[in-house]
């Protein structure tokens, strides 16, 4: 069951959406508590993903998702990535929170999670030049997986931004 | 149960189109992830992956062969097919189909779980 | 194409003793997170059968003493202890991109 426009539960912060789809969570009898995702959000787990379809260079992806109180999406896990990827369309290629400001091949996520190399999902030689410093996930029909590709990040792309559920 | 049958003419000439049927049972070709693979092995050596056909029919070829390859499908009656043209002595072999689970999405799969007993093929004058 | 390189060609193995088989990738079978490695087991009249799937998966139904290892590059097939029944030809198999290649094959033999 969603509830939405329960924005009055929660006086204590102005929030920039003005929609939330809820669901009730089981707790304590004496307790009301919802976990809520932005209208027209993704719900995955304890966060919420929006799949922007405008396109925007890497800098400017993230600062539209900090204007919705997010951020680029950062990979945890398998099961969370092949969520996303059911989400995504084949033909277009989206920013993650993932690049490598320097050149020097030291990938950071946006969050600060450590870049761990054994938890990558790099395509086939990739990623492949220095001055590629940003990660977009994409699908390659050959062998037909979605994965991570370097690339320029001036270049515009769609993007995926990513938050915390609010809980009312 | 998952199985799979190849069958063929047996015997023909150089010269000639190879048609193959690989008949299944036990898992559906529309369903997302799935896939069928001709793969060909020649008396005593070893094997050879010739084509493979997805769920969406999207297909993949040995480029090797791929001007002489078709590999298409029919889900209703699920079966796969592969057309060899102007075969040679040198495509005497035994067939196998082999299903492929490749799940969509992911980043797993891609390897052949369960093969036919295959068709064995004499190209002969 | 990835060209995958098998040694030995084929070799003897005393009942109960450990066989190691080798196969060489001539580039990374690395992506995505796995490496995109199989291993088959194929003996006379029969078709192949998984045992060994992305480098070191067991396949259902595999014997334990069947396992493997290795990343990249170089991946190893390991039966320990043999046993009679293993005496077969083992072959690798990458799909990390098309086209999709096997190794030449191992034939192992019984003493």
């Known amino acids: 069951q969603k509830y939405s426009q329960l924005l009055e539960k929660k006086t204590t912060k102005e929030l920039v959406h003005t929609t939330l789809e809820c669901v009730k969570k089981n707790m304590p009898v004496e307790e009301t508590a919802w976990s809520c995702c932005p209208k027209n959000w993704k719900s995955f787990s304890s966060n919420c993903y929006f799949i922007s379809t405008e396109s925007a260079s890497w800098q400017d992806s993230e600062k539209d998702c900090a204007r919705m109180e997010a951020h680029l999406l950062v990979i945890n896990t398998q099961e969370e990535q092949d969520f996303i990827f059911q989400n995504l369309q084949e033909e277009s290629a989206y920013f993650v929170g993932l690049s490598d400001p320097e050149g020097q091949r030291h990938w950071q996520w946006v969050d600060q999670t450590p870049y761990n190399e054994s938890s990558t999902f790099w395509h086939p030689r990739e990623p492949s030049d220095p001055n590629e410093r940003c990660v977009v996930l994409n699908f390659r029909k050959s062998p037909k997986r979605w994965g991570w590709n370097d690339v320029n990040c001036l270049g515009p792309q769609r993007s995926v931004c990513e938050m915390m559920k609010i809980h009312l | 149960q998952v199985t799979l049958k190849e069958s063929g003419p047996g015997i023909l000439q150089p010269s000639q189109t190879l048609s193959l049927t690989c008949s299944f049972s036990?898992?559906?070709?529309?369903?997302?992830?799935?896939?069928v693979s001709w793969i060909r092995q020649p008396s005593g050596k070893g094997l050879e992956w010739l084509a493979h056909i997805y769920w969406d029919d999207d297909k993949r070829y040995n480029p090797s062969l791929k001007s002489r390859l078709t590999i298409f499908k029919d889900p209703s009656s699920n079966q796969v097919f592969l057309r060899i043209t102007s075969v040679d002595t040198a495509d005497t072999a035994t067939y196998y189909c082999?299903?492929?689970?490749?799940?969509?999405?992911?980043?797993?799969?891609?390897?052949?779980?369960?093969w036919g007993a295959g068709t064995t093929v004499t190209v002969s004058s | 194409n990835i060209v995958l390189t098998q040694s030995p060609t084929s070799f003897t193995v005393s009942l109960g003793q450990r066989a190691t088989i080798s196969c060489r990738a001539s580039?990374?079978?690395?992506?995505?997170?796995?490496?995109?490695m199989h291993w088959y087991q194929q003996k006379p009249g029969q078709p192949p059968k998984l045992l060994i799937y992305l480098a070191s998966n067991v396949e259902s139904g595999v014997p334990a003493r069947f396992s493997g290892s290795g990343s990249r590059t170089d991946f190893t097939l390991t039966i320990d202890p043999v046993e009679a029944d293993d005496a077969a030809t083992y072959y690798c198999?990458?799909?990390?991109?098309?086209?999709?290649?096997f190794g030449g094959g191992t034939k192992l033999e019984i003493k």
């Open positions: 036990g898992f559906s070709l529309s369903t997302s992830g799935m896939g």
């Open positions: 580039e990374s079978v690395h992506s995505y997170g796995n490496s995109f």
């Open positions: 082999a299903r492929n689970s490749h799940y969509y999405g992911s980043t797993y799969g891609g390897y052949f779980d369960v």
């Open positions: 198999q990458q799909n990390s991109e098309d086209p999709w290649t």
